[in-house]
Structures are given as structure tokens and as C-alpha cells.
Interface confidence: low
Amino acid sequence: RKIPKVGHTFFQKPESCPPVPEGSMKLDTGIINENQRVSMSRNIESRSTSPWNYTVTWDPNRYPSEVVQAQCKHLGCINAQGKEDISMNSVPIQQETLVLRRKHQGCSVSFQLEKVLVTVGCTCVTPVVHHVQ
Amino acid sequence: GIAIPRNSGCPNSEDKNFPRTVMVNLNIHNRNTSTNPKRSSDYYNRSTSPWNLHRNEDPERYPSVIWEAKCRHLGCVKADGNVDYHMNSVPIQQEILVLRREPRHCPNSFRLEKILVSVGCTCVTPIVHHVA
């Protein structure tokens, strides 16, 4: 397997780095690649055999404030005739991302990074059959 | 930035928008949750649009390991195990936020970075272009 590059995550003389209290880090929320856009195949959420809907969750104390979550439309999958086939299962595909959470404690504000699980879409799978003895 | 509602009894000193630079607690909430999709489910094998998972590793990034999905087939797998090329396996992509050290030289200073990952694949009906 490819040797991972360690590259240039160097130290620096303390005087040229921002002073950071123990247990904290300085975070620049100006996002690198901010204008990158997803170029997925058109309307795959409705064309999929395991179609899904999108719901936008909004939280003003989270950055980014909008997180889009997918929900599978059916328990089964859509067959060639356009009917739901319950011998197959529509299941969610999930991915972790980081969000920045803003917490208010009285008049003081603190920030914490949080790993959140986003449902990205759905896929059609063969079910796991459990045989009863 | 995003608008933040403020406690009306607090001094009106902070910008209502999310600040460009913040000090953040190092303890990432939910940091220990599983990041290996192979361990969390076997959908990548059981799907009608199966995919392989490739380990994308970058020690300069947090999280340092991200799994990238690559669809195994152009078509979708039928019940008999054969591939149906009348249907298409397509990747489901998602933008995620990761941490990148910036300035590069400072051990406690980071910037958010948006990256595009393929999370899995789904089986879709193809878009048919009719030639006039």
C-alpha cells in the first residue's frame, strides 16, 4: 500500500504562532475549498432503486448551520416495474463530518468541534436472512 | 457567517455573525465514534450497486483516515448475481468538513477544509438521451 506522506506539518517558534491556551486550539472558520460543489449524477435521489428525500436541518448555534439529511422513502426497493419489492431493503448510507458547535453559558460563549453522522443517501441491499432453528 | 441569537441581558459586544477565528476546546465531541465503514456495516458487499472502500490517508488532516467508495460495476447486480447494464451504479458524494493545520507551522492552529468524498453507491435508472 502507498506510503502516506507526512509532509509539512512542522513546529514553529512559539513567538510566530498564535498564543493558544492549554486544552484549546485556534480555528479559522474560513473554509478551504469553500466553493467546491458536489457534481453527482442528476436527480439520483429520485432515480435510485432505493430513492430518498432530503431534509434540511437548521441550527443557528452550529457551523455550518444547514446540514442536509437523507431519508429512504421505502423499506424495500423499487423494481423494474416501478413497484416496491420488499424482498430487498433500502438502507441509509452514512458519513461523518465535523461541525463547530457554539455553546452559551450565561453571557460567555464557548466553541467545540463535534463529529456528526450525516445520512447521505440510500442503497438497495439483499437482506440478511436469520434462520430460526 | 451565521447569525447567532444572543441572550438579551448580555453586553452587546460580540458580532452577531459566526466569528472568522475562534478558540475551540480540543476535546472533539464524539471523537471516538467508529470511522471504519467496513466495521460498521457490510452494505458495500450486499448492495445491488456494490463498492470497494479505499483508505485515503493524510496525517496532516483530521480525521487522518477517510474511506472513499468506488463503484465495482457500471451496471447493477441482479438477484442471480449477474450485472444488469440497463441500470447504472453511481457514487453518492458528500461534502464534509475536516481540519487542516494552518498556518502550517503552528501545532495548535487549524482551519476548516471542505472535501468531497464518495460515500457509497446506489443503483439508478439511466437517463436516456433520444437522438432526434
Epitope: 507526512v6 | 470511522t35 487522518s64
Partner: antibody
């Protein structure tokens, strides 16, 4: 101040096992990558393994892969190295060291312990 | 793995001398190189990182230079506390590797 104290070294027969420990203090242990580096008598330094802050990301040098296991207990501020199938060539002073970066590895080491000696001999 | 070759393996010098140690990488590593000092019975101490940046608290008579495959550690005026063994370390890729060391002895 930052302190790293290794323990668990000793004399062991070839094929035997040892577990080294490294007790950390003076910094937030759970935020830092940690590493083990060894030095054979009269020889240079050899990096053998590192572990990420949460323990989810681990590397080994080829010379110890499959025989040594690095682990950590963030609640106890402790780093460990389980050494199995020991060979004469594993005889060395074993140092635990702190990676200088927070959250992300820098792969350089700003604090080192004083080392613990492992001797593999029949 | 990237090999680091240090030369000389040992040298004798007097207090006040200018001393130069070289480290050559088997392939280009940009400036991803660190230098450590080790005294007998002690743990190594980080001196220089990023090929030329001095770690906090390290005296300015020590300096580093180089990029790609050839690197140099220079002590402009050798002091009694500088007699030790010096190691280079690359952090360009895993496995991390160290040079074989250069022992600086009193003439």
C-alpha cells in the same frame, strides 16, 4: 512540566514477551500522538511505532510489525508497548516520545522519556 | 524507506571551532528534516525542525540548512556542552527514519 516515564523493561529470553509502559504528566495526554523509538546498544535511533490521540490510527516499522502492539489509555495518561516473540535484535533502550502536534501528527518529537532497557538473551 | 546517511560518523574538534555535519537523504524530502542532540545516557533533544528552524530554547550558534536531499547542521562556535551525538530525522513519509548519527568529540 512535561514528563514521560517509561517502565517494564528487563531481561527476557528469545520468544518471550514484555509490556512496556509510559506514564505521561504535565500536558493533556489525550490530545497528542505518541510514539516509541528504540536504540540498540552503541547504535542509532530507530522509530518503531506511533499511535494517534484517540488510538484509532497506528503505524509500525516493518521490523516489529505483527510482533509489537502499541496502545494507550487516555484515562490513565499511559502509553503501552506489548512486545511478543522477542528476538536478540530487539535488545535496546526503548523511549516513549510525544509528537509535537495537537490533533494532527507532526512526526517530530519534542519531549522524550529517559528510556527503559530491554535485553533479549538466552 | 527513505535512508538518511550522516557524515562524518565522528569528528574531533576544539572549543570555538566551527563544525559542520551533513545528512543526505536517499530521495527528495523537501525540507521535512529535524536534528536531535543526544548526550550519553540521556534521551535525544530536538534542536532543529523544517531543516532550518531553531527549536525554542536552542542557542543560535546552531543552524540548519538544506532542502531536497542534502542537509547541513552547523555549530558556529563549539561550546563544551555541544560535545554529543547528533542525529537527523526525516518526517516526509513513513516509516520515519533517522541518520546513523555523528559523534562530536573533544580534540
Amino acid at each position: 512540566q512535561v514528563q514521560l516515564v517509561e517502565s517494564g523493561g528487563g531481561l527476557v529470553k528469545p520468544g518471550g514477551s514484555l509490556r512496556l509502559s509510559c506514564a505521561a504528566s504535565g500536558f493533556t495526554f489525550s490530545n497528542y500522538y505518541m510514539t516509541w523509538i528504540r536504540q540498540a546498544p552503541g547504535k542509532g535511533l530507530e522509530w518503531i511505532s506511533y499511535i494517534s490521540s484517540t488510538g484509532g490510527n497506528i503505524y509500525y516499522a516493518d521490523s516489529v510489525k505483527g510482533r509489537f502492539t502499541i496502545s494507550r489509555d487516555n484515562a490513565q495518561n499511559s502509553l503501552y508497548l506489548q512486545m511478543n516473540s522477542l528476538r536478540a535484535e530487539d535488545t535496546a533502550v526503548y523511549y516513549c516520545a510525544r509528537d509535537g502536534g495537537v490533533i494532527i501528527s507532526t512526526a517530530m518529537f519534542d519531549y522524550w522519556g529517559q528510556g527503559t532497557t530491554v535485553t533479549v538473551s538466552s | 524507506a527513505i535512508q538518511l546517511t550522516q557524515s562524518p560518523s565522528s569528528l574531533s574538534a576544539s572549543v570555538g571551532d566551527r563544525v559542520t555535519i551533513t545528512c543526505r537523504a536517499s530521495q527528495g524530502i523537501s525540507s521535512a528534516l529535524a536534528w536531535y542532540q543526544q548526550k550519553p545516557g540521556k534521551a535525544p533533544k530536538l534542536l532543529i525542525y523544517d531543516a532550518s528552524s531553531l527549536e525554542s530554547g536552542v542557542p543560535s550558534r546552531l543552524s540548519g540548512s538544506g532542502s531536497g536531499t542534502d542537509f547541513t547542521l552547523t555549530i558556529s562556535s563549539l561550546q563544551p556542552e555541544d560535545f554529543a551525538t547528533y542525529y537527523c530525522q526525516q518526517f516526509n513519509s513513513y516509516p520515519l527514519t533517522f541518520g546513523g548519527g555523528t559523534k562530536v568529540e573533544i580534540k
